[in-house]
């Protein structure tokens, strides 16, 4: 038979048991609070670093684009695509209609200073979007030129010139001295491209990739 415990020993065991219970409770609470802290701090740090990255990215553009208009991309609140205000956006690009009259080279330099190029038109849809913002009685330089006068047309961003995706007015291009392309409106054919002299001042269209932040 097991000998009965002394009252003193019983108290000692109870105290030890209580200590173990309290220790486990404290450890559990500590673990829970660590888990809670971690679950709060990690996203906070993640959000903080993302914000810092965004701010530094915005600072890059601030010199030429003090104001950006941004829209949420998809369902993810983290991803925004922006265009400088008051540029317009279409698909993955931003567009700016420059109403100052400048030569082709100066127009390209002007776009370049803003982190853009004279517009490269890749599809009919893109042209249809662009013409919504143009005035019918004006002509606008495109990022398309033939500096050698040999009908080797080239886009400013080195996109290959594809004869199948061109929108020349009928009979154009028609002059080897006219080495730069404009988009303009002809009542008979609506909007299309024409070759003109590069040194003659025209309005222009700049295009840049959207800014993702």
């Amino acid at each position: 038979m097991v000998p009965e415990e002394e009252p003193q020993d019983r108290e000692k065991g109870l105290w030890w048991f209580q200590l173990k219970v309290w220790s486990m409770a404290v450890v559990s609470i500590l673990l829970l609070s660590v888990c809670f802290t971690v679950s709060s701090v990690v996203p906070h740090n993640f959000m903080y670093s993302k914000t810092v990255k965004r701010l530094s990215k915005l600072r890059e553009y601030q010199q030429y684009h003090p104001s950006l208009t941004c829209v949420m991309e998809g369902k993810d609140i983290e991803d925004w695509s922006c265009c400088p205000t008051p540029w317009t956006s279409f698909q993955s690009s931003c567009y700016f209609i420059s109403t100052g009259m400048q030569s082709w080279t100066k127009s390209q330099k002007n776009c370049s200073v803003m982190g853009a190029d004279l517009v490269v038109i890749n599809t009919r849809e893109e042209q249809d979007f662009i013409i919504q913002n143009l005035k019918r009685n004006s002509s606008y330089f495109l990022g398309l030129s033939d500096p050698g006068g040999r009908r080797h047309w080239q886009w400013v961003d080195q996109t290959p010139y594809n004869e199948n995706v061109t929108f020349w007015h009928s009979g154009e291009p028609n002059n080897l001295d006219e080495r730069c392309a404009i988009i303009n409106f002809r009542s008979s054919e609506e909007w299309g491209w024409n070759d003109i002299h590069c040194h003659v001042p025209q309005k222009s269209i700049c295009k840049m990739k959207k800014i993702y932040i």
């Epitope: 030569s103 080279t105 100066k106 500096p147 080897l176 001295d177 080495r179 730069c180």
Partner: antibody, heavy 121, light 111 residues
């Protein structure tokens, strides 16, 4: 041999008109842009007007815009400058020059001997 | 308009020496390695004659004593060695944009 021969200069009163001509030979006139450049007595060169080869574009500096008109007749190998509302400051030797395009610009590779226009009362 | 400033306005050079004329543009006349600055010679009572096109290209029939250099806004016409029949006015001209403009000219006299 490329030749450009101007004619039509003379003495005219302020507010009067003159028409200058430039006869071109020795090259395919219709393939080249052409310009008029003038030089006031003892002064430098000043561009006055340009017409593209296909006759589709004409350009003028502000100093003559609305008063001078450049035109061409490719069938006659001739370039013209109609000058109206003439002023004393239009007094100069007027040169006809052929433009040769290079890259995004051009230069004047042949010049005529010039014709003198004097505007005086 | 692009303003072209030539210097000096005049210079006197001995035959066999080098003459250097500079032309400064109020803004760049270069684009992607092409420099749209040209030089002309004009002798008294004659029309201008093309010497150099696109900054450094010698026009056909022009003696190799004439040379051009420069880019962006600063251009130079050099005559080396100078000969007696080089006495003339020399003009620079830009064509990167309308209106095409000329420098004020440099008068070269032979000592």
């Amino acid at each position: 041999e490329v030749q450009l021969v101007e004619s039509g200069g003379g003495l005219v009163k302020p507010g009067g008109s003159l028409r200058l001509s430039c006869a071109a030979s020795g090259f395919t006139f219709s393939s080249y842009g052409m310009s008029w450049v003038r030089q006031a007595p003892g002064k430098g060169l000043e561009w006055v007007a340009t017409i593209s080869s296909g006759d589709s574009y004409t350009y003028y500096p502000d100093s003559v815009k609305g008063r001078f008109t450049i035109s061409r007749d490719n069938a006659k190998n001739s370039l013209y400058l109609q000058m109206n509302s003439l002023r004393a400051e239009d007094t100069a030797v007027y040169y006809c020059a052929r433009q040769l395009y290079y890259s995004y610009g051009y230069y004047f590779d042949y010049w005529g001997q010039g014709t003198t226009v004097t505007v005086s009362s | 308009d692009i303003v072209l400033t030539q210097s000096p306005a005049s210079l006197a050079v001995s035959p066999g020496q080098r003459a250097t004329i500079t032309c400064r543009a109020s803004e760049s006349v270069s684009f992607h390695g092409t420099h749209l600055m040209h030089w002309y010679q004009q002798k008294p009572g004659q029309p201008p004659k093309l010497l150099i096109y696109a900054a450094s290209n010698l026009e056909s029939g022009v003696p190799a004593r004439f040379s051009g250099s420069g880019s962006e806004t600063d251009f130079t016409l050099t005559i080396n060695p100078v000969e007696a029949n080089d006495a003339a006015n020399y003009y620079c001209q830009q064509s990167i944009e309308d209106p095409p403009t000329f420098g004020g000219g440099t008068k070269v006299e032979i000592k």
